[in-house]
């Protein structure tokens, strides 16, 4: 889809249904919420293989818009996705906005809320903190780290993230939300107001990443199941023979 803004409300509803994304009526005040859901869904479904380095340097908004040529990059919608949405307690009237580890980078001091429901997450106490750069590597080294983030209730003033969970009627108009209807962070978004949990759709890689040849040979090597059974069998037989000979010795001391 080159431009979701060109879709009619009915067409957008069809797309939401195709992706198994629960939704209410698509109207002006909720349209961006659903566009954001679609963006999130497509990002989640996109395969893990990163683009080549040469291509990465030339990505543009038009690349972002285009999914027509990327059909093979997405898996088909799965039932599990719908279940994931349902398990979050979504219905047509309210969406839970669980903004785990909402991070704001370079946010100016004393800034108010930037897009309505998203509160200003960070207020830097001084100029040095304002220019402070938080590196991704420092924030998260793995998806396990992200899960830990959810368990931490709140962070200090200089921290760039905090958890926000609240409910909001989907039909709320943007004007009633102080012109900032669309949260931009949640771990939040560039233009959005949907339920954006940072990782509730994220799947872990089934296989660990390839290791360098020879890495972890020794301590990581495991005995196969048949080998374990064989060892167990030998152990049982040895015990049996020990028991047998002990019995024989008791019965015949000479």
């Amino acid at each position: 889809m080159d431009n979701y803004a060109d879709l009619s409300d009915t067409e957008l509803t069809t797309l939401l249904r195709r992706y198994n994304i629960p939704h209410g009526p698509v109207v002006g005040s909720t349209r961006r919420l659903y566009e954001k859901k679609i963006f999130e869904y497509e990002t989640q479904r996109r395969r893990l293989s990163p683009p080549s380095s040469s291509a990465a340097s030339s990505y543009s908004f038009s690349d972002l818009n285009s999914t027509r040529g990327d059909a093979d990059m997405y898996d088909l919608p799965k039932k599990e996705d719908a279940l994931l949405y349902q398990s979050k307690g979504y219905n047509d009237d309210y969406y839970e906005e669980s903004y785990f580890t909402t991070r704001t980078y370079g946010e100016p001091e004393s800034a108010g809320p930037s897009r309505a429901v998203r509160q200003s997450v960070t207020s830097f106490p001084d100029a040095d903190a304002f220019h402070h750069q938080v590196h991704d590597d420092d924030l998260l080294s793995s998806s396990e780290e992200e899960c830990k983030d959810r368990e931490r209730p709140m962070y200090g003033r200089d921290s760039a993230y905090q958890s926000i969970t609240h409910y909001r009627p989907v039909s709320a108009s943007r004007s009633s939300l102080d012109l900032s209807y669309y949260p931009t962070s949640s771990s939040t978004s560039f233009m959005s107001s949907s339920s954006s949990s940072s990782s509730w759709l994220t799947r872990r890689a089934i296989r660990p990443e390839n290791r360098a040849p020879g890495a972890g040979l020794g301590q990581d090597r495991q005995v196969p199941l048949w080998g374990q059974l064989l060892l167990f069998l030998v152990f049982v037989i040895v015990l049996f023979f020990i028991y047998h000979f002990m019995q024989a010795e008791e019965g015949n001391p000479f």
């Epitope: 889809m1 431009n3 979701y4 803004a5 060109d6 349209r31 961006r32 566009e35 954001k36 963006f39 999130e40 990002t43 989640q44 683009p51 990465a56 990505y59 543009s60 908004f61 690349d63 972002l64 818009n65 903004y99 785990f100 580890t101 909402t102 991070r103 704001t104 980078y105 370079g106 946010e107 930037s114 998203r118 997450v121 991704d136 924030l139 998260l140 998806s143 992200e146 669309y182 949260p183 931009t184 962070s185 949640s186 771990s187 939040t188 978004s189 560039f190 233009m191 959005s192 954006s196 949990s197 940072s198 990782s199 994220t202």
Partner: nanobody
Framework: QVQLVESGGGLAQPGGSLSLSCAAS????????MGWYRQAPGKKRELVAD???????NYADSVKGRFTISRDNAKTTIYLQMNSLKPEDTAVYYC??????????????WGQGTQVTVST
Amino acid sequence: QVQLVESGGGLAQPGGSLSLSCAASGDIFSIYAMGWYRQAPGKKRELVADITNYGSTNYADSVKGRFTISRDNAKTTIYLQMNSLKPEDTAVYYCNADSYSKLRGWVVYWGQGTQVTVST
């Protein structure tokens, strides 16, 4: 991460025009939308205009018909064309980008800000 570099701004007379631009670099593939916010002294930061990568635009009521937000597909840059400027448009204008990744979820990025002053 996403880096945002703003340019433009400066001094303009009431009724005049100014143009702002904001170039995104880094993990631009994850960007969902980009926009402009402004913060006048002693006031809360407010949305001016924004544009999603799907093409949807949104404007604050106070700038509708005077400001236009657009983007350059090739350079991943957004522009804010400000016409019929008023003294109340005086503020620091911040570029803003929202991105989504599997690992970090939704993240908001901010530029350093550029001053716009409308005065006679």
